[in-house]
Amino acid sequence: EEELQVIQPDKSVLVAAGETATLRCTATSLIPVGPIQWFRGAGPGRELIYNQKEGHFPRVTTVSDLTKRNNMDFSIRIGNITPADAGTYYCVKFRKGSPDDVEFKSGAGTELSVRAKPSAPVVSGPAARATPQHTVSFTCESHGFSPRDITLKWFKNGNELSDFQTNVDPVGESVSYSIHSTAKVVLTREDVHSQVICEVAHVTLQGDPLRGTANLSETIRVPPTLEVTQQPVRAENQVNVTCQVRKFYPQRLQLTWLENGNVSRTETASTVTENKDGTYNWMSWLLVNVSAHRDDVKLTCQVEHDGQPAVSKSHDLKVSAHPKEQGSNTAAENTGSNERNIY
């Protein structure tokens, strides 16, 4: 009679992570008597996957009933496959011996490849806010995918970005891979409502890329523009001066009025109005009693925005002449105006 052969008909098997892998194996003879064992890998370091004779292998089931006397099908199913299960599996026939069974013949091996989906991309931006015209970096990471081939794209508000660098690790063979990409984005004043999107496409995703997003509202700081104007006289000796704080983001803002360099009042922006682009406007006013001043008054609106150094705008209030009704842009009002930026 011809000597027993162990046949593994599949050179390779490909499954998705989470699926069940079927590893086929048949013997050509019932003789010699002895059990079958499945191993991952060859040589002394091989890992026992299934032993027909003894042991507990909760993830492994046999395709046929191995207790039947004439059974020659030793195929197994391995459930809930992960990338760590990848490798070459050998079906090995043992001959009954005393005290131990002796390895008789091995199959040619079946290479199990596992395809695993990438994790949802995580996008992170800079630790500190930046102002328009500055370039900021965003990173995108996704892990645990196999095979290595993967496509990553960056978008800002639906427009594809080109200034980015991507690495897939490790460089050599591995059961699974990770991708890391850094994109450079130039901020504009209109970016409060903008989104940066990292899109990852992989064969396991069935054509539905995974996306990670970052809102530029968490990255951008739009500094305010200030305008100090003198309003028409409200009473004989009172002048209303307003400070318009425009187009700022985020909302965190503190305003201080100074009269001739002395703090008159400090307030925090509360009832702001929101612009279409997501920035805010706010107005503060100061009622100045002209009769309390002998000389001209220098009024300064000083704004500290989002913990940044204060910016200020001043307005010279003439008290020598009788105050008359003035518009917000009269020559007299602008004469002594100046703007100081402190960085």
């Epitope: 998705a16 081939d149 064969v203 054509g207």
Partner: antibody, heavy 118, light 109 residues
Framework: EVQLLESGGGLVQPGGSLRLSCAAS????????MSWVRQAPGKGLEWVSI????????YNADSLKGRFTISRDNSKNTLFLQMNSLRAEDTAVYYC???????????WGQGALVTVSS | QAVVTQESALTTSPGETVTLTCRSS?????????ANWVQEKPDHLFTGLIG???NRTPGVPARFSGSLIGDKAALTITGAQTEDEAIYFC?????????FGGGTKLTVL
């Protein structure tokens, strides 16, 4: 057993429209990207379109210039191809095919013949 | 658009090993092109044999294998049988679309 069954083919005049269906059985449609591929008489295969597993993303052959639209109803396990402004050169057998892992045309239907002629 | 080129016809004998190739006009075929091989038998019967360069569809005989040879994708039939007589199409993926080759008519005499 995986089966794909196309229907809706027939004779249509140039400029007309036709909607092909592909009824899938033996698997859950939403777990797979699906494709339409056509074969003109005596010619080779030409890829037409892909619908992603969710149906949210589509990939189309540039040559069709937006005349064909792929869609799916995952609840009914059915894939569709809406063909508008048909031309004589669109005459072909249209096949739906399943994509395993998005990179593997593993199962094909038997095809639906579309003839565009006046 | 890329052009995918295959041998128009090949002839082999039963038991012989035959290799069909698939070339891309854009350069070397890589694993990112996810080479597919599809068999057409009479009466428009199509079967997906190989996907993703080298993965055999369940139920397809082990004598069919896919690989990259040099700058081309290849389908090798080890020990061809008379029932393997058919037309074989390869398909390559280019970022957002597939392109099929013209097909190879394989005769097994």
């Amino acid at each position: 057993e995986v089966q794909l069954l196309e229907s809706g083919g027939g004779l249509v005049q140039p400029g007309g429209s036709l909607r092909l269906s592909c009824a899938a059985s033996g698997f859950t449609l939403s777990s797979y990207a699906m494709s339409w591929v056509r074969q003109a008489p005596g010619k080779g295969l030409e890829w037409v379109s892909i619908s992603s597993g969710s149906g949210a993303n589509t990939y189309n052959a540039d040559s069709l210039k937006g005349r064909f639209t792929i869609s799916r109803d995952n609840s009914k396990n059915t894939l569709f191809l809406q063909m508008n402004s048909l031309r004589a050169e669109d005459t072909a057998v249209y096949y739906c095919a399943r994509l395993r892992f998005f990179d593997w045309f593993d199962y094909w239907g038997q095809g639906a013949l579309v003839t565009v002629s006046s | 658009q890329a052009v995918v080129t295959q041998e128009s016809a090949l002839t082999t004998s039963p038991g012989e090993t035959v290799t069909l190739t698939c070339r891309s006009s854009t350069g070397a075929v890589t694993t990112s092109n996810y080479a597919n091989w599809v068999q057409e038998k009479p009466d428009h019967l199509f079967t997906g044999l190989i996907g993703g360069t080298n993965n055999r569809t369940p139920g397809v005989p082990a004598r069919f294998s896919g690989s990259l040879i040099g700058d081309k994708a290849a389908l090798t039939i080890t020990g061809a049988q008379t029932e393997d007589e058919a037309i074989y199409f390869c398909a390559l993926w280019y970022s957002n679309h597939w392109v099929f080759g013209g097909g190879t008519k394989l005769t097994v005499l």
